[in-house]
């Protein structure tokens, strides 16, 4: 059990107050983290509270401002980037969001040597992506879907690609589906370690069907947003990878990197690129049917001026029980010999673990093992490998950082974080300086988050970077709910759950229950992290019990649980939520006449199916921006888990797993359906089809749309949304306003 430390003494009870919805909407109890912007083994940059950019040297203890807030303010800069030679800084302003990761901005180059902005050959605007070379001060940027190179900030640009066209050809940046579902970045270009070469992806969306929706704005006529968006089974983007020599780019021009023959024989994806050395690069490819991934190591042949990817350097990763990898196929972390690497993939027992690959995947040496999972490899040095896992005390929802000494034999393992602040900190990430000389640990909970700096050799804590003192003080008079993380064992399935209980929780009383669900493949909701959010308020002020349950299809507990949903989304995720609710009722403190479920996105799909399950368990529920049919969602994501919507593949389950097919079953529940009309991700179409099916079935329901809002329902819509959902739940649970 993880209980929030109670600060309530009887004498103080009248000074304590419950959380309010206003607290949540105002972000009163938000926390800060500190991620150093490392620029060497012992130096980092950080933007101070007053917006100066400060350079810290850990070894000398000195710090100095490299860029004043005055300079930042002069161009309204909201972000910055120091060139590796420390001569220039780019300043980013006019941030304009596009999709989840992508945005455009205006960039100014500031010359630190003379304290002036670089004049002449200024950058065009708006730029879609810009980055420094890893050495020196070359610049690569993407403007109007084409890539440009500057040898020095004041130099004129060299145009590398010329075929870029809006919504047609994307160079150096991903199209919608690659950004959201494959790369999870705003960029698709990669400098080699010393800046000799620049690799980039070209995405051709010419033949992709377009999703079109109205953006109402303020004009007399709405405008139409058009996005090439491949839904399940549709034509996909065609990807090519090129590499150009940045020293003399006008000579050879970009060289295309060959696709492995076994991949190129049918539809495929490019999944990631990792530079090993300036003349060796590693590309990862994936078949459209995403159970086969190929890692290809390519070498530059100076005499031919070409990239050679020998078959002997192709490593195949295949899943026979599900899809390849977890959410994404893992990326390799190369060792110092520049050919062998460490990679996370399933072991013979079906748990994701670190393996060391020297020649073939078949001969891989397993580095970690157990009925838990290695989650991320942070850094490999000459003698150590740093990774995170959920091994400690067998809680899947924790993250601790481990060090394996790979320089000694046999390798020894040490948990760096397990006992640092055991009650407060059970969920960590880390950020390492060059050669792992130093590292920052960022603890996300379950207590108040804290960021600390450590010596990479001894693991000794050097200093606290951020401990959220103000937050701690602000929470002193707040009655926070209690949280517990436990598990249910049902039919050989372990269902971990997090329960959020009202501050004065009494097991002998009956409470309304709200299930918050996400439940998507390879997700995890039950995590030992700190949060003061809407459900905290519902428990603290409105006296609800909130539960989150990780059922089949969720991550970090082995392939049996993860791949259980393969090719049949919408079945077991829903079953497991229902099973958990039944178990919660058996615990005796749940009012079984007041049970609700809510979720967003995939969670909206699961909550809708749970409400329409015909069990009579749920009185009401909310679906925010739900998927309603897998035929409406993106190919890359959907097909990974469902295969293709064709007769000879999995069309039958595509049809059986829609929300619309269960319209009749909503008759006996109160359903609130919510969606943004400008949702580029889960299109409004999904909710439009649910609404149509419910109307056709003559089923009453409630709905709310948010005009011109995307999948995140941000800004004022957030306030409206949570206020609206609160009213709905209070009404459902007969709670007075």
């Amino acid at each position: 059990i993880v209980l929030r430390p109670s600060r309530v003494h009887n004498s103080e009870e009248n000074t304590m107050r419950a959380l309010t919805l206003k607290d949540i909407l105002n972000g009163t109890f938000s926390y800060k983290t500190f991620f150093p912007n490392w620029i060497s083994g012992q130096e980092y940059l950080h933007q101070s509270a007053d917006n100066n950019i400060v350079l810290y040297n850990i070894e000398t203890g000195q710090s100095y401002t490299i860029l004043s807030n005055r300079t930042m303010k002069s161009v309204n800069a909201s972000n910055y980037g120091l060139s590796p030679d420390r001569q220039f800084v780019y300043l980013e302003s006019d941030y304009s969001k596009l999709w989840r990761y992508s945005y455009t901005a205006t960039y100014y180059i500031y010359d630190l040597s003379n304290g002036e902005f670089v004049r002449g050959n200024e950058l065009p605007r708006p730029i879609q992506y810009l980055c420094w070379s890893p050495v020196g001060s070359k610049l690569a940027y993407v403007y109007q879907n084409n890539i440009y190179l500057k040898q020095r900030p004041g130099d004129p640009p060299f145009q590398i690609t010329f075929n870029g066209r809006e919504n047609k050809i994307f160079n150096g940046i991903p199209d919608w589906v690659y950004e959201e579902e494959m790369l999870a970045t705003k960029y698709a270009l990669w400098w080699s370690p010393n800046g000799k070469f620049l690799a980039y992806a070209e995405f051709n969306d010419t033949d992709i069907p377009v999703i079109a929706y109205s953006y109402y704005g303020d004009e007399q006529y709405p405008r139409t947003i058009n996005i090439p968006y491949p839904k399940a089974g549709a034509k996909n983007p065609v990807v090519r990878i090129f590499i150009i020599d940045t020293t003399y780019p006008a000579y050879v021009g970009p060289q295309e990197v060959p696709v492995p023959a076994m991949i190129a024989s049918s539809d495929y994806y490019f999944s990631w690129l990792t530079w090993v050395t300036d003349e060796r690069v590693c590309l990862q490819w994936l078949k459209r049917v995403q159970n086969v991934s190929v890692l290809s190591i390519c070498d530059f042949r100076e005499d031919w001026q070409t990239w050679d990817c020998p078959k002997t350097q192709e490593h195949i990763e295949e899943s026979r029980t599900g899809w390849a990898g977890g959410f994404f196929v893992s990326t390799p972390v190369f060792s110092y010999d520049a050919i062998s690497y460490y990679k996370i993939f399933s072991d013979k027992d079906g748990y994701k673990h670190i393996h060391y690959i020297k020649d073939t995947v078949e001969n891989a040496i397993q580095i970690t093992s157990g009925k838990w999972e290695a989650i991320n490899i942070f850094r490999v040095t000459q003698d150590s490998l740093f990774y995170s896992s959920n091994e400690f005390e067998e809680y899947p929802g924790r993250r601790n950082i481990y060090r394996i000494s790979i320089g000694s034999y046999p390798p020894s393992k040490k948990c760096v974080t397990c006992h640092l602040r055991k009650e407060r900190c059970q969920y960590y990430t880390a950020s390492f300086s060059d050669y792992a000389k130093y590292y920052a640990l960022v603890c996300y909970g379950p207590g108040i988050p804290i960021s600390t700096l450590h010596d990479g050799r001894t693991d000794q804590e050097i200093k606290i970077l951020e401990e959220n003192k103000e937050l701690e003080n602000a929470l002193k008079n707040i009655q926070l709910p209690k949280e517990e993380i436990k598990k249910l064992e049902v039919d050989e399935i372990t269902l971990w759950y997090k329960m959020i209980l009202p501050p004065q929780f009494d097991r002998s009383k009956k409470y309304p229950l709200l299930i918050q669900v996400y439940g998507g493949p390879c997700s995890q909701s039950v995590r030992s992290v700190f949060a003061v959010n809407w459900i905290s308020y519902l428990a603290s002020k409105e006296g609800m019990v909130i539960a989150l349950v990780d059922g089949r299809g969720t991550a970090f507990q082995g392939d049996k649980l993860l791949y259980a949903v393969y090719r049949k989304l919408g079945v077991y995720e829903v079953e497991d939520q229902i099973t958990a609710v039944r178990k919660f009722i058996e615990m005796g403190f749940i009012d079984e006449k007041r049970i609700a479920i809510w979720g967003w996105s995939y969670g909206g799909y699961v909550s809708s199916l749970a409400l329409a399950s015909g069990t009579g368990l749920f009185k009401c529920g909310i679906a925010v921006a739900p998927v309603s049919s897998w035929e409406y969602y993106a190919s890359v994501y959907t097909e990974r888990f469902m295969g293709l919507p064709t007769k000879d593949d999995n069309l039958e389950h595509y049809k059986n797993s829609t929300v619309m097919a269960r319209a009749e079953y909503f008759r006996n529940v109160d359903y609130l359906l919510i969606h943004g009309t400008a949702d580029d991700n889960v299109h409004f179409q999904n909710s439009a089809q649910i609404a149509k099916a419910l109307v056709n079935a003559q089923v009453d329901f409630q709905a709310m749309w948010y005009s011109d809002q995307n999948h995140g329902l941000s800004g004022l819509s957030t306030n409206h949304l949570y206020t609206h959902m609160t009213h709905f739940l209070k009404q459902c649970f007969s709670l007075s306003d």
Partner: antibody, heavy 116, light 108 residues
Framework: EVQLLESGGGLVQPGGSLRLSCAAS????????MSWVRQAPGKGLEWVSA???????YYADSVKGRFTISRDNSKNTLYLQMNSLRAEDTAVYYC??????????WGQGTLVTVSS | EIVLTQSPGTLSLSPGERATLSCRAS???????LAWYQQKPGQAPRLLII???TRATGIPDRFSGSGSGTDFTLTISRLEPEDFAVYYC?????????FGQGTKVEIK
């Protein structure tokens, strides 16, 4: 030893067509960008067209829509299909190794004369 | 397009003398994209200098290049009889790549 050998030049009437070839040897042709550069009699050099190893084509405005550059990597040969020829296209046509600059190897050239 | 203007049009010098050829661009050219070529009558051009100052393979060290921005120079420190030819500068910064009109180095 790198060698580039042009052929296909000759006398052609205005409006006529001609196809130039450039046979390459001594290097991995399939992995190099190639260009055509011309030189009118007694004049300077003028870049005409280029093609990446992967096939993307680039043209000078003066020939766009009339000339087509192509390559056959299996034959190690570069081509320039010239249509709607004009008197001002009269020149020695060189094939050169390179995209937009650093043309490190050139053929001996082939003369194209456009005249009625 | 970028216009490259070479001067002088003709340079009359004796063997053993120093030749200084100028190339001026109508707009800024990054050093990486500036090359020099030599052409003798009835022959194809030959690459001399890349990146404004780096000698191409097999080019003797009496040839040197310098300059940046809009002004570039090719210097032949001591003219040899075989150096009498036409010299072209060329930019590959933007499409179309362009050549200067040439400087003829002739025997005085």
């Amino acid at each position: 030893e790198v060698q580039l050998l042009e052929s296909g030049g000759g006398l052609v009437q205005p409006g006529g067509s001609l196809r130039l070839s450039c046979a390459a040897s001594g290097f991995t042709f399939s992995s190099h960008a190639m260009s055509w550069v011309r030189q009118a009699p007694g004049k300077g050099l003028e870049w005409v067209s280029a093609i990446w190893a992967s096939g993307e084509q680039y043209y000078a405005d003066s020939v766009k829509g009339r000339f087509t550059i192509s390559r056959d990597n299996s034959k190690n040969t570069l081509y320039l299909q010239m249509n709607s020829l004009r008197a001002e296209d009269t020149a020695v046509y060189y094939c050169a190794k390179g995209w937009l600059g650093n043309f490190d190897y050139w053929g001996q050239g082939t003369l194209v004369t456009v005249s009625s | 397009e970028i216009v490259l203007t070479q001067s002088p049009g003709t340079l009359s010098l004796s063997p053993g003398e120093r030749a200084t050829l100028s190339c001026r661009a109508s707009q800024s050219v990054s050093r990486s994209y500036l090359a020099w070529y030599q052409q003798k009558p009835g022959q194809a051009p030959r690459l001399l200098i890349i990146g404004a100052s780096t000698r191409a393979t097999g080019i003797p060290d009496r040839f040197s290049g310098s300059g940046s921005g809009t002004d570039f120079t090719l210097t032949i420190s001591r003219l040899e009889p075989e150096d009498f030819a036409v010299y072209y500068c060329q930019q590959g910064q933007v499409i179309p790549p362009t050549f200067g009109q040439g400087t003829k180095v002739e025997i005085k």
